[in-house]
Interface confidence: low
């Protein structure tokens, strides 16, 4: 590529809107999935809008497996928080499943077949990493 | 983006090596899948190397569904041909499944869980579109 041009996203990532997404090919617990994303200068998936949710639902429509996202909470009395500490906006989606369970490792959210579920963070699942797309020439 | 810079691949496509790949979110027969790719200025997946195969196997590792690729043959006495008319290189992979079956619509190849299978082209499946990445400034 010409030197002053930079791709919006690295190879193997999907560019959508302002972000790049990588669907993991390995199955890990939530913390390891988070570390994997961090090693790629990214974070676990954060859904900011219904448009984001629509895209992700479409992107995983051909999978029946669960994917960790960057949403977790310490116990049922705590709010669902994204990795950056911001709360889940209730109009986006409702977390289903084991929402009132308490796990020593915390409760983490995964997306599967378009719905979001609560589960023990220690379980292994695929994951979705996300980082800002490079939308300027470098 | 700066005017003289063009992304290697459009949004929602995955850039890998010299190509862009799009995993369909809808399920169609082989011919309709081919038309869908053509409408996006692309073709159905063509695997040219073991590296290509490794990438595709990794990219669909979290799906248990079949994906049409651009490989078909009229009947068992014909060779497997890619859409551009080139033959399947035997060292790449072996087509499994209904290889000796004859179907009115022809026999088409799909990839599922890393292996390639023969099936009736009239059946519905997901698909993978592919086109050349734009690796130069425009």
């Amino acid at each position: 590529r010409v030197a002053n041009c930079s791709a919006p996203c690295p190879q193997d990532w999907i560019w959508h809107g302002e972000n790049c997404y990588l669907f993991s090919s390995g199955s890990f617990n939530w913390e390891n999935s988070q570390e994997k994303c961090l090693s790629l200068d990214a974070k676990l998936l954060k859904i900011n809008s219904t448009a984001d949710l629509d895209f992700i639902q479409q992107a995983i429509s051909y999978s029946s497996f669960p994917f960790w996202m960057g949403l977790s909470r310490r116990n049922p009395s705590y709010p669902w928080l994204w990795e950056d500490g911001s709360p889940l906006m209730p109009h986006l989606f409702r977390v289903r499943g084991a929402v009132s369970q308490t796990y020593p490792s915390g409760t983490c959210a995964y997306i599967q077949r378009g719905a979001v579920y609560a589960e023990n963070c220690i379980l292994a699942a695929f994951s979705i990493c996300q980082k800002k797309a490079n939308l300027r020439a470098q | 983006r700066v005017a003289n810079c063009s992304a290697p691949c459009p949004q929602d496509w995955i850039w890998h090596g010299e190509n862009c790949y799009l995993f369909s979110s809808g399920s169609f027969n082989w011919e309709n899948s081919q038309e869908k790719c053509l409408s996006l200025d692309a073709k159905l997946l063509k695997i040219n190397s073991t590296a290509d195969l490794d990438f595709i196997q990794q990219a669909i590792s979290y799906s248990s569904f079949p994906f049409w690729m651009g490989l078909s043959r009229r009947n068992p006495s014909y060779p497997w041909l890619w859409e551009d008319g080139s033959p399947l290189m035997p060292h790449l992979f072996r087509v499994r499944g209904a290889v000796s079956q004859t179907y009115p619509s022809g026999t088409c190849a799909y990839i599922q869980r890393g292996a390639v299978y023969a099936e009736n082209c009239i059946l519905a499946a997901f698909s993978i579109c592919q086109k050349k990445a734009n690796l130069r400034a425009q």
Partner: antibody, heavy 129, light 111 residues
Framework: QVQLVQSGAEVKKPGASVKVSCKVS????????MHWVRQAPGKGLEWMGG????????IYAQKFQGRVTMTEDTSTDTAYMELSSLRSEDTAVYYC??????????????????????WGRGTTVTVSS | QSVVTQPPSVSGAPGQRVTISCTGS?????????VHWYQQLPGTAPKLLIY???NRPSGVPDRFSGSKSGTSASLAITGLQAEDEADYYC???????????FGGGTKLTVL
């Protein structure tokens, strides 16, 4: 600091409806989850319903479902609780209350953790023929 | 009958320590939902005393403390004072009822 100002006392006949208001100041209503709690004379506190951050909607205690409606007028930052088909057992003080007011979080999701730290003074509703 | 149980009354002399228990189940306190405690003086609205099991809002004396274990929680008041005479309520969330629940209340009498 959040303050909740409730409407005045009401006397109603059995079968009628009552609508109690609760005006928020110091915050906007959309930043808070409003709940309604009642207390019959000489009895304990009874949760009637309120905004649930998990669902992003108002939920009602099973006992009151079908009889109670909780609404919000965000233009005036006022919450309302309407109870229909009144009977003598509904004679009580009705409180509006919100979590996380004093904590200043302004984040509805913290409700389960903070408890209801700001209360209105209560509205006495008497149901008598 | 409340799904969260408190003793109807407790009493203690000034300066003494008293505890009030709050017993729930696996669908509320035992499910991990936090417990909050309220104090209600006669003729006034309830006041939050303890939130999140053991945290005191600003202005609440450190004579009041809360704890939680398993399916139950307790409120402890040390150095009992005459002005502590009031009704005390615990509260949690119940996932099977999909709503908040209060204990039946405990009347504290300072002898």
């Amino acid at each position: 600091q959040v303050q909740l100002v409730q409407s005045g006392a009401e006397v109603k006949k059995p079968g009628a409806s009552v609508k109690v208001s609760c005006k928020v100041s110091g915050y906007t209503l959309t930043e808070l989850s409003m709940h309604w709690v009642r207390q019959a004379p000489g009895k304990g506190l009874e949760w009637m319903g309120g905004f649930d951050p998990e669902d992003g909607e108002t939920i009602y205690a099973q006992k009151f479902q079908g009889r109670v409606t909780m609404t919000e007028d965000t233009s005036t930052d006022t919450a309302y609780m309407e109870l229909s088909s009144l009977r003598s057992e509904d004679t009580a003080v009705y409180y509006c209350a919100t979590p996380n007011g004093q904590q200043g979080k302004g984040v509805r999701g913290w409700d389960y953790y903070y408890g209801m730290d700001v209360w209105g003074r209560g509205t006495t509703v008497t149901v008598s023929s | 009958q409340s799904v969260v149980t408190q003793p109807p009354s407790v009493s203690g002399a000034p300066g003494q320590r008293v505890t009030i228990s709050c017993t729930g189940s696996s669908s509320n306190i035992g499910a991990g939902y936090d417990v909050h405690w309220y104090q209600q003086l006669p003729g006034t609205a309830p006041k939050l005393l303890i939130y999140g099991n053991s945290n005191r809002p600003s202005g609440v004396p450190d004579r009041f403390s809360g704890s939680k274990s398993g399916t139950s929680a307790s409120l402890a008041i040390t150095g009992l004072q005459a002005e502590d005479e009031a009704d005390y309520y615990c509260q949690s969330y119940d996932s099977s009822l999909s709503g908040w629940v209060f204990g039946g209340g405990t009347k504290l009498t300072v002898l």
